[in-house]
């Protein structure tokens, strides 16, 4: 009868570091000839075990007895499999050559070895500078390593998901597989608190997919916005003015006073009012006195926030005489958005 | 280098038992099938017993099935060869020999001689 | 009596090639070795697997195969060649391990 080659799997997935059994039956013993394993077809195949002694096959054995003169089971296991172990194996039964090398006459189905190499830890990196809310920023995932090449990537904003995200699944051997995904998000004022979670599901996890973060409080600037007010002080001749620096986001604040365009004052903050939105508040307090002045000064509040352009806010302290010895001070709204303090001087 | 040294030899009576043994060194002992090979004085060479690796399968011809039994312990790296019921025809220089893939020989020992006789 | 056939004897002198033939194992089935002894030693393995020599054995010792026919070839005999020669089997339709009778090599002069 016809001899047969049976590889009962056509294919068996095991975990990278564990063992892989490849099964290899063969229904006669004659014709006399050595069975072989080959990884891959044709001309590109390439030996892996053959039941000749005297070779060397680090790594793989033989399942059963080989040496029983009655044996028909050629099955061989690998040991420590790697992801390079990938691929399809033949098990080859050859009869012995008169003149010429032994010849091939029966190949089995074939066996397709899958190795399980579970995916990285996802990295998820963010811009390499802040935005501000209204642009639209890239988040990229990146996870390494698995196999096989099927995996599922989701991207998940305060736990909704997310589209207009691209990703792609390379390979420099076809052996494992890496993934990067890039999302676009556009960044609203509320985002401070916000993350972005990149969910990576693959067979190996079993069930428990691997998440890498990005916190949008490490990419987002909401910049100040700026008001200055007044307090007037008794004695008369002594204005408080205050610059209130509101809603802003991260920390990083420097404000400086000018009078007529030189600088008077520099604020280093350390201490700030925090928000419910994630964002902070700072007031600034100048003292002036209006006595030394006896023209308009212009007061400007000047904020560097996070190395951006400075913004400013301007208030001009104007003053004029009155012949009375007491001293009067009003606000006069001005369209530029300058307020306008008159102030009445003591004569002496 | 690969070894093979039998002892055990020597007279018995026609009916009696005798047990040889083979010791191995050398090669993976464990991982090789062997054979016992008989050469009657001045005659040819006779396999008479073969033995798979792990010692779970047994071979004889018919001349000798039945009254030799071959086994072997991987442990202590050593062939034996139990012969009962011997007779007169069973006198030879008995080799221990390591089977190839193919259950030729690759490598003998020195041999024994057994001697049976009345 | 010997399952496999070959020469009681051959002679040759020195320099010349010697061929020993083994004939009467079933091509299908049979895996052949040669084999050489000496008065007095244990046998040693000239060739298996029909045609394959161990590193230890000189290149002069030959195997070759033709149907079921095998043949030994020693090329350049020398003096110390002189020896029996075995033809060994493997069945694997039996699995037995048959041998010739053994064959006289003479090398004259």
């Known amino acids: 009868k016809e001899l047969k080659v049976t590889q009962a799997d056509k294919s068996v997935s095991v975990a990278a570091g564990d063992s892989a059994t490849l099964n290899c039956t063969v229904s006669s013993l004659t014709p006399v000839g050595p069975i072989k394993w080959f990884k891959g077809e044709g001309q590109n195949r390439s030996p892996i075990y053959s039941f000749i002694g005297g070779e060397h096959f680090p790594r793989i054995t033989n399942v059963s007895d080989a040496t029983k003169r009655n044996n028909m089971d050629f099955s061989i296991c690998i040991s420590n499999v790697t992801p390079e172990d990938a691929g399809t194996y033949y098990c080859v039964k050859f009869q012995k050559g008169i003149v010429e090398p032994d010849t091939e006459i029966k190949s089995g189905g074939g066996t397709t070895l899958y190795v399980l190499a579970k995916p990285s830890s996802p990295e998820v990196s963010g811009p390499d500078s802040r935005g501000s809310p209204g642009q639209t920023v890239n988040f990229t995932c990146k996870s390494y390593g698995f196999s096989p090449r099927n995996i599922t990537l989701k991207w998940l904003k305060d736990g909704k998901e997310l589209s207009h995200l691209e990703t792609t699944i390379s390979s420099k051997s076809n052996v494992s597989y890496n993934i990067s995904s890039t999302v676009s998000v556009k960044l609203s004022p509320e985002d401070i608190h916000s993350r972005v979670i990149c969910e990576v599901a693959h067979v190996t996890l079993e069930g428990r997919p691997l998440n890498g973060t990005a916190n949008f409080s490490n990419i987002i600037r909401v910049s100040p916005t700026l008001k200055i007010t007044q307090q007037p002080l008794t004695p008369a001749s002594q204005v408080n003015l205050t610059c209130q620096v509101q809603k802003f986001y991260p920390k990083a604040l420097q404000l400086n006073w000018l009078e007529n365009g030189n600088l008077s004052r520099t604020d280093k903050p350390e201490h700030f009012t925090d928000n419910r939105d994630g964002t902070y508040n700072y007031t600034s307090l100048f003292l002036v006195n209006s006595s030394a002045h006896r023209e308009d000064v212009v007061f400007t509040c000047q904020v560097e926030h996070d190395s951006q352009p400075a913004i400013t806010e301007n208030h001009t302290v104007r003053a004029f005489a009155h012949s009375s010895s007491g001293g009067s001070m009003e606000t006069i709204p001005d369209n530029n958005a300058y307020y306008n303090w008159n102030h009445h001087h003591h004569h002496h | 280098e690969v070894q093979l040294v039998e002892s055990g030899g020597g007279v018995v009576q026609p009916g009696g038992s005798l047990r040889l043994s083979c010791a191995a060194s050398g090669f993976t002992f464990s991982s090789n099938a062997m054979s016992w090979v008989r050469q009657a004085p001045g005659k040819g060479l006779e396999w008479v017993a073969g033995?798979?690796?792990?010692?779970?399968?047994?071979y004889y011809p018919a001349s000798v099935k039945g009254r030799f039994t071959i086994s072997r312990d991987n442990s202590k790296n050593t062939l034996y060869l139990q012969m009962n019921s011997l007779r007169a025809e069973d006198t030879a220089v008995y080799y221990c020999?390591?089977?190839?893939?193919?259950?030729?020989?690759?490598?003998w020992g020195q041999g024994t001689l057994v001697t049976v006789s009345s | 009596s010997y399952e496999l056939t070959q020469p009681p004897s051959v002679s040759v002198s020195p320099g010349q090639t010697a061929r020993i033939t083994c004939s009467g194992g079933?091509?299908?089935?049979?895996?052949y070795a040669w084999y050489q002894q000496k008065p007095g030693q244990a046998p040693v393995t000239l060739i298996y697997s029909d045609d394959k020599r161990p590193s230890n054995i000189p290149e002069r010792f030959s195997g070759s195969s033709s149907g079921t026919t095998v043949t030994l070839t020693i090329s350049g005999v020398q003096a110390e060649d002189e020896a029996d020669y075995y033809c060994g089997g493997y069945d694997q339709s039996s699995y037995t391990n048959p041998f010739g009778g053994g064959t006289k090599l003479t090398v004259l002069g």
């Open positions: 079933s091509y299908s089935s049979y895996y």
């Open positions: 020999a390591r089977e190839t893939w193919n259950h030729l020989f690759d490598y």
């Open positions: 033995i798979s690796a792990g010692g779970s399968d047994t």
